[in-house]
Interface confidence: medium
Amino acid sequence: AGLKLMGAPVKLTVSQGQPVKLNCSVEGMEEPDIQWVKDGAVVQNLDQLYIPVSEQHWIGFLSLKSAERSDAGRYWCQVEDGGETEISQPVWLTVEGVPFFTVEPKDLAVPPNAPFQLSCEAVGPPEPVTIVWWRGTTKIGGPAPSPSVLNVTGVTQSTMFSCEAHNLKGLASSRTATVHLQALPAAPFNVTVTKLSSSNASVAWMPGADGRALLQSCTVQVTQAPGGWEVLAVVVPVPPFTCLLRDLVPATNYSLRVRCANALGPSPYADWVPFQTKGLAPASAPQNLHAIRTDSGLILEWEEVIPEGPLEGPLGPYKLSWVQDNGTQDELTVEGTRANLTGWDPQKDLIVRVCVSNAVGCGPWSQPLVVSSHDHAGQQGPPHSRTSWLVPRGSSAHHHHHHHHSAWSHPQFEK
């Protein structure tokens, strides 16, 4: 098979957007399977047409409606003949157009009067490509060969820059880059104390506008009264916009405020936010818990707990917790140091304990009292009582924060 590209020069140059028809003539084969190849890859589309001129003469067409830069390359056609592939002479297709930008000026944020650079690059074909720079509507540099770097000594207000690329086919304009001025950040807002304990406070806030410069850190200032002596100042890297304040005094009034800084300096402070740390839970367990059995039930008594210091605040009600080995358990809150227990089974052993609470929580549990289901002769108790006394093993004055109906898993209640 004699195979040649008909009517096409070895180099074909077209303008961008123009139609192109490559044709390939095959002679000496009755039914050629003509394939078009571009840069080594078979062209897998239907923009192709095969026309029989005569029994042994075919023309294949590859049709491009509107040539683009991506269509440029080396084309040839090929046919299979007796297991061998025959290849035509190639055509180099060049698509010319106005310059195409490969690098365009980018938006920047710079400090006032600080020097900066902008880059621009464009390519043909046709080459050469020259670059002209614009600042707003004023031409400021060029023509210079592509690529081009514009050095600017500084700006004092937001300014627009663009570049223009020229070649024999015409000119193309780049995107417009805006060079913004950096500024100090705005004050943070929504400053919130998210968690409070007796000695710690968690703080969160929303950053204000960053002044077009990355926020680097925020400072949390703590005083014991707005405008009072600074107790604490914590500098935290951001994000996240949170801070944990440690080692605060319990039951104390504080105020805090926050500011954030970028490379240019700090923002104004946000408004003061007052908060109060929680007091301490009671430190002591009620002492001398004992029981008096009566005909109508069981009376429990214990000694009053006196606050160990002002940080415990006023001590509130007592919390009484009891359980029986049949699984019955309950809890009651009483104001005084005496409680009347009902609803328990006198046939089963009863274990009782008590703690005193305040606004923070319950103090440590008292030593557990076991009330036996039968009398033990010779036990000393108040007159007319039918009370059994048992000294508990492994007595405990540990501080356990009370969780409803979960206290019975503590070791002092286990065998």
């Epitope: 008909m6 009517g7 028809k21 044709n23 039914e31 399977d33 897998q44 589309n45 239907l46 923009d47 047409l49 095969y50 026309i51 029989p52 001129v53 023309i59 067409f61 049709s63 491009l64 409606k65 509107s66 683009e68």
Partner: antibody, heavy 125, light 108 residues
């Protein structure tokens, strides 16, 4: 004279299989592509796919890939459109179309097409 | 999948100019073809490669393409031009053809 003769109208039940044909004459069958085009009652034209008589190479439209099979028999110059399992939505007129071009002695192709008369396929229970 | 969009209907008086549009994202790179289908008949190729008239088609039929829009123009429409017109083009990938939804031309 180029002629495309299509098989006659057919009525089938859903789930049935069917093959319709398009026999070409008046030209060298292997030189050209044949397309199948569907037209549902009162609706527009839909390109289903095409086959080149020479190498039986096929192309399908996305909506028809896997639903129909296009084939050709060079010895009888016939193109076929086949369904394994018909659905009521397959009720339509089916045209076969021969695509062609000539160079009029030059190297600029002139297009022409020949359409078959169509085969009406009705799928109804 | 790729779509070509046409107006459902266009009406003109005899002798007026009718314009039928077809829009598709690939039309800047792919040629448009136009078919005429009269009631109960098979379609006929009217225009190929955007603007080339098929043999035997009257000169009043012309085609053009700009950007993503192809247009079929009938200058001095006749009553016999009343038909459905379909645009037809390659998908953006170039490996399957697509018809537009069709435009019913009424010549009142």
């Amino acid at each position: 004279e180029v002629q495309l003769v299509q098989s006659g109208a057919d009525v089938k039940k859903p789930g049935a299989s069917l093959t319709i044909s398009c026999q070409a004459s008046g030209y060298t069958f292997t030189d050209y592509w044949i397309s199948w085009v569907r037209q549902k009652p009162g609706k527009g034209l839909e390109w289903m796919g095409q086959i080149r008589g020479q190498h039986s190479s096929t192309l399908y439209g996305p909506s028809f890939q896997g639903h129909v099979t296009i084939s050709a028999d060079r010895s009888t110059a016939t193109a076929y459109l086949q369904w394994r399992s018909l659905e009521a939505s397959d009720t339509a007129m089916y045209y076969c179309v021969r695509h062609g071009a000539s160079t009029s002695g030059g190297t600029i192709p002139e297009y022409y097409q020949h359409w078959g008369p169509g085969t009406l396929v009705t799928v109804s229970s | 999948s790729y779509e070509l969009t046409q107006p459902p209907s266009v009406s003109v008086s005899p002798g007026q100019t009718a314009r039928i549009t077809c829009s598709g994202d690939a039309l800047p790179k792919k040629y448009a073809y136009w078919y005429q289908q009269k009631s109960g008949q098979a379609p006929v190729l009217v225009i190929y490669e955007d603007a080339k008239r098929s043999s035997g088609i009257p000169e009043r039929f012309s085609g053009s393409s700009s950007g993503t829009m192809a247009t079929l123009t009938i200058s001095g429409a006749q009553v016999e031009d009343e038909a459905d017109y379909y645009c037809y083009s390659l998908s953006d990938s170039g490996n399957y053809f697509v018809f537009g939804g069709g435009t019913k031309l009424t010549v009142l």
